[in-house]
């Protein structure tokens, strides 16, 4: 007996060939021996089976001795043994229809779990193997679970269902709702305008929700809400904003915040949360602000940084075109009685400059 695997909602063609390449009598029946379709004269006739409105045959191939049965919009309950009767012989085809669906919405928040459920005919014992867009392989039986979705799980999952050495492939599009980056750091000189951007890692036709940016300044004892906003069909509207600092927010996506100037008292880290309509949970993105200040006071040239910096970052003071430098893995460096000239304050990570500020030291006569 031939085994054919089908996918729920798809179309399948069950083939049946006569030895003689000519139009002849044929019938397709189900396992109850009830006629599904057949030929009467030159016409296709349909029996009263449940497939009456979904079964068809390629009339153009009849005179080639090919009497296939096409079943549209497959259902799990179409799984059955079908019998083709032609030229006094019977050909049996076992059709097994499978369905693979995500238990919840296919738009899930980062960190949420994804469960894929296999619908299968009674008596079948299929195995399922799924491959994520990032190449992660997961195996299972009736259900497949991915406990914590990551950003890279967004995209098309390819799942292969195997039964009786036959396979059928399902493609399921999963959208992980997250910001493009989990965390970002902005490095600015004191007084510069600061731009914070929070691009989303997905696109939705209608995007509605609300958000807030909480800020923990390095110098402050507690965090405070800097801004709250609404998102309606990708349009952003500010609900509430603090007086100090007075943030500005872009009206369109990606979410964009502007801090008029970087000041040491603002240096710190923030957490932008976005709650989407009809979704439980929130999207998060951490944002850090590092502010640099270079000052000369009397005979002391000082460079300082505020905000969340890694201990491995190097802060240096360097006189332009001269070898004289002072470097430290610290948040402040200084030079006493600096030489006249253009000094550079550099914040760097393994030789890569993250932030620089120039200060001119004038000679003292």
């Amino acid at each position: 007996k031939k085994v054919v695997l089908g996918k729920k909602g798809d179309t399948v063609e069950l083939t049946c060939n006569a030895s003689q390449k000519k139009n002849t009598q044929f019938h397709w029946k189900n396992s109850n021996q009830i006629k599904i379709l057949g030929i009467q004269g030159l016409f296709l006739t349909k029996g009263p089976s449940k497939l009456s409105d979904r079964a068809d045959s390629r009339k153009s191939l009849w005179d080639q001795g090919c009497f296939s049965m096409i079943i549209k919009n497959l259902k799990i309950e179409d799984s059955d043994t079908y019998i083709c009767e032609v030229e006094n012989k019977k050909e049996e085809v076992e059709l097994l229809v499978f369905g693979l669906t995500a238990n919840s919405d296919t738009h899930l928040l980062e960190g949420q779990s994804l469960t894929l459920t296999l619908e299968s005919p009674p008596g079948s014992s299929p195995s399922v193997k799924c491959r994520s867009p990032g190449g992660k392989n997961i195996q299972g039986g009736r259900t497949i679970s991915v406990p914590q979705l990551e950003r890279q799980d967004s995209g098309t999952w390819t799942c292969t269902v195997s039964q009786d050495q036959k396979t059928v492939e399902f493609k399921i599009d999963i959208v992980v709702l997250a910001f493009q980056k989990a965390s970002s750091t902005v490095y600015k000189k004191e007084g510069e305008q600061v731009e914070f951007s929070f691009p989303l890692a997905f696109t939705l036709e209608k995007l509605t929700g609300s958000g807030e940016l909480w800020w923990q300044a390095e110098r402050a004892s507690s965090s405070k809400s800097w801004i709250t906003f609404d998102l309606k069909n990708k349009e952003v509207s500010v609900k509430r904003v603090t007086q100090d600092p007075k943030l500005q927010m872009g009206k369109k996506l990606p979410l964009h915040l502007t801090l008029p100037q970087a000041l040491p008292q603002y240096a710190g880290s923030g957490n932008l949360t976005l709650a989407l309509e009809a979704k439980t949970g929130k999207l998060h993105q951490e944002v850090n602000l590092v502010v640099m200040r270079a000052t000369q006071f009397q005979e002391n040239l000082t460079c300082e940084v505020w905000g969340p910096t890694s201990p491995k970052l190097t802060l240096s003071l360097k006189l332009e075109n001269k070898g004289a430098t002072v470097s430290k893995q610290a948040k402040a460096v200084w030079v006493l009685n600096p030489e006249a000239g253009m000094w550079q304050c550099l914040l760097s990570d393994s030789g890569q400059v993250l932030l620089e500020s120039n200060i001119k030291v004038v000679p003292t006569w």
Epitope: I34, K35, Q40, G41, P48, K50
Partner: antibody, heavy 120, light 107 residues
Amino acid sequence: QVQLQESGPGLVKPSETLSLTCTVSGGSISSFYWSWIRQPAGKGLEWIGRIYTSGSTNYNPSLKSRVTMSVDTSKNQFSLKLSSVTAADTAVYYCARELEKRNYYGMDVWGQGTTVTVSS
Amino acid sequence: DIQMTQSPSSLSASVGDRVTITCQASHDISNYLNWYQQKPGKAPKLLIFDASTLETGVPSRFSGSGSGTYFTFTIRSLQPEDIATYYCQQYDSLPLTFGGGTKVEIK
């Protein structure tokens, strides 16, 4: 056991639409075809068509242009609408269950029938 | 559509008589044939399916035979409660069609 009961107006004016409902009791409406058959007085039986619980239908070609069937699984009911009626549509209308099992296909449960007269 | 021709349209027989009704299909319908009994003022009742198989609870005096286009229905020994109209019905192809019926009366 499963019982069927037809309901609807006994008198319909010519050119109007005949509407009948069949209520299934004592069993589930799911996973069966449910059919309508009519019988003019002193005449034979005519299969009007059928509806599956998913909503898919098959109609008799002779009536197809005028027939609409629907199903309401939550109420365990299915319905028949026959538009543009004439006196020729006067008949006893039966609802029935079509049952398929091995080597078997038949209308095994019937309603008692309801008489519909088309007259002005 | 498949036409079903039943004959005779009516018959009168005595209690205990053997009664035979024939049904002819316009096309080969294999054994896809049912026989129904309809008593006056009642809904039809399925007696025989698959041309020759008796529905559960149907008395064994009823029988059916035939295949292809020609079928017969027999009441071996007519009883007073058998007064009814008998219909054949094909289920080979949609639309499902019935024969014109045979009215059986007691002499």
